[in-house]
Interface confidence: medium
Amino acid sequence: ESGYAQNGDLEDAELDDYSFSCYSQLEVNGSQHSLTCAFEDPDVNTTNLEFEICGALVEVKCLSFRKLQEIYFIETKKFLLIGKSNICVKVGGKSLTCKKIDLTTIVKPEAPFDLSVIYREGANDFVVTFNTSHLQKKYVKVLMHDVAYRQEKDENKWMHVNLSSTKLTLLQRNLQPEAMYEIKVRSIPDHYFKGFWSEWSPSYYFRTPEINNSPGEMDP
């Protein structure tokens, strides 16, 4: 059973599984970066447990995380972004487990937004566009995007298209006529930074026309 350690019970605490994972978000709030960590075991009793990051920081040796329910969080400008940091789970000032992590290799981009689909009658295609906050960023500018779409009735039959731009054309002949489609997009760092897929954008829904039908913009 997972529990927290009293001061005299550190030996017992070390038997627990305190493995954790983290992701960073760069320039997530102006020039501020964030780092979010959480235990992999959702049943870990996090009372009295703290996270601390040391090394590869500007101006300070270490920073403590804030606890927000079951996650641990830092927002700061002080990430050096070259070099490995030591992230430790601590109780009563003693480290229970630590990981050396380069924050540039655990970047999770912000989710794309403003996803929309416009039908072009003359071209018989659908132009998918979306936006990403990363176009304005200094660091994580180069992303690969994963556009996923499916016919609404086909719950698990997602089609995926990877692209580096924020515009995609879907040919009408590759879609079923008179069908409702759901489409969404997510992003992952490409080039210098590494990491994880962003959250999915909100889904956009559009209907394909009948053959030879010619509506304008698809309404969600």
């Epitope: 070259i82 490995k84 380069d102």
Partner: antibody, heavy 121, light 109 residues
Framework: EVQLVESGGGLVQPGRSLRLSCAAS????????MHWVRQAPGKGLEWVSG????????GYADSVKGRFTIFRDNAKNSLYLQMNSLRAEDTALYYC??????????????WGQGTTVTVSS | AIQLTQSPSSLSASVGDRVTITCRAS??????LAWYQQKPGKAPKLLIY???SLESGVPSRFSGSGSGTDFTLTISSLQPEDFATYYC???????????FGQGTRLEIK
């Protein structure tokens, strides 16, 4: 004991190439960025190039950009500087240096004794 | 790139003197500055990092101060072994870039 030992310097004609090596020991090499710093005779320190622990972050001084290439082999605990199209003004003592980012930001806390490069016809 | 300008370029002082060397950055660098000492024929040695933190093993007569653009290295009471050249150093993390000041030569008067 933490140690950096440079090698590969020598006398070379202008326009030719040379490769410097730096053998590291006594610390976890692949936790640290590494740098080359040079010092021309009677002059000050000039940073030449730096490389992050995983080789994804690389920088060069303007004076060597396009001519010098920094690379590392973490399996061999070694840092290298490939110097092409050498010029007389590249004549200097070349130091290999280890960064120590746990100090709060990049500082060069361990230096080798240097290897001399002389470019002359 | 950010430029670092040290002053004076050289100075003469006597054992026991209090000595101050300044380093000015062409733009604000917070406290991201280090100081090194170099003796003839030797590799540089780290003295101060993070503008004011003393490196382990460095005598307490050395101190650093400053933030933003203006930084100071002070030797409170000069010892014979302190006669050397001193350099300030700044970094930029993206892209990886380091800049040194031009150096200050401290000589015996």
């Amino acid at each position: 004991e933490v140690q950096l030992v440079e090698s590969g310097g020598g006398l070379v004609q202008p326009g030719r190439s040379l490769r410097l090596s730096c053998a590291a020991s006594g610390f976890t090499f692949d936790d640290h960025a590494m740098h080359w710093v040079r010092q021309a005779p009677g002059k000050g320190l000039e940073w030449v190039s730096g490389i992050s622990w995983n080789s994804r972050g690389i920088g060069y001084a303007d004076s060597v950009k396009g001519r010098f290439t920094i690379f590392r082999d973490n399996a061999k605990n070694s840092l290298y500087l490939q110097m092409n199209s050498l010029r007389a003004e590249d004549t200097a003592l070349y130091y290999c240096a280890k960064d120590e980012y746990s100090r709060g930001y990049y500082v060069l806390d361990v230096w080798g004794q240097g290897t001399t490069v002389t470019v002359s016809s | 790139a950010i430029q670092l300008t040290q002053s004076p370029s050289s100075l003469s002082a006597s054992v026991g003197d209090r000595v101050t060397i300044t380093c000015r950055a062409s733009q604000g660098i917070s406290s991201a500055l280090a100081w090194y000492q170099q003796k003839p024929g030797k590799a540089p040695k780290l003295l101060i990092y993070d503008a004011s933190s003393l490196e382990s093993g460095v005598p307490s007569r050395f101190s650093g101060s400053g933030s933003g653009t203006d930084f100071t290295l002070t030797i409170s009471s000069l010892q014979p072994e302190d006669f050397a050249t001193y350099y300030c150093q700044q970094f930029n993390s993206y892209p990886l870039w380091i800049t040194f000041g031009q150096g200050t030569r401290l000589e015996i008067k």
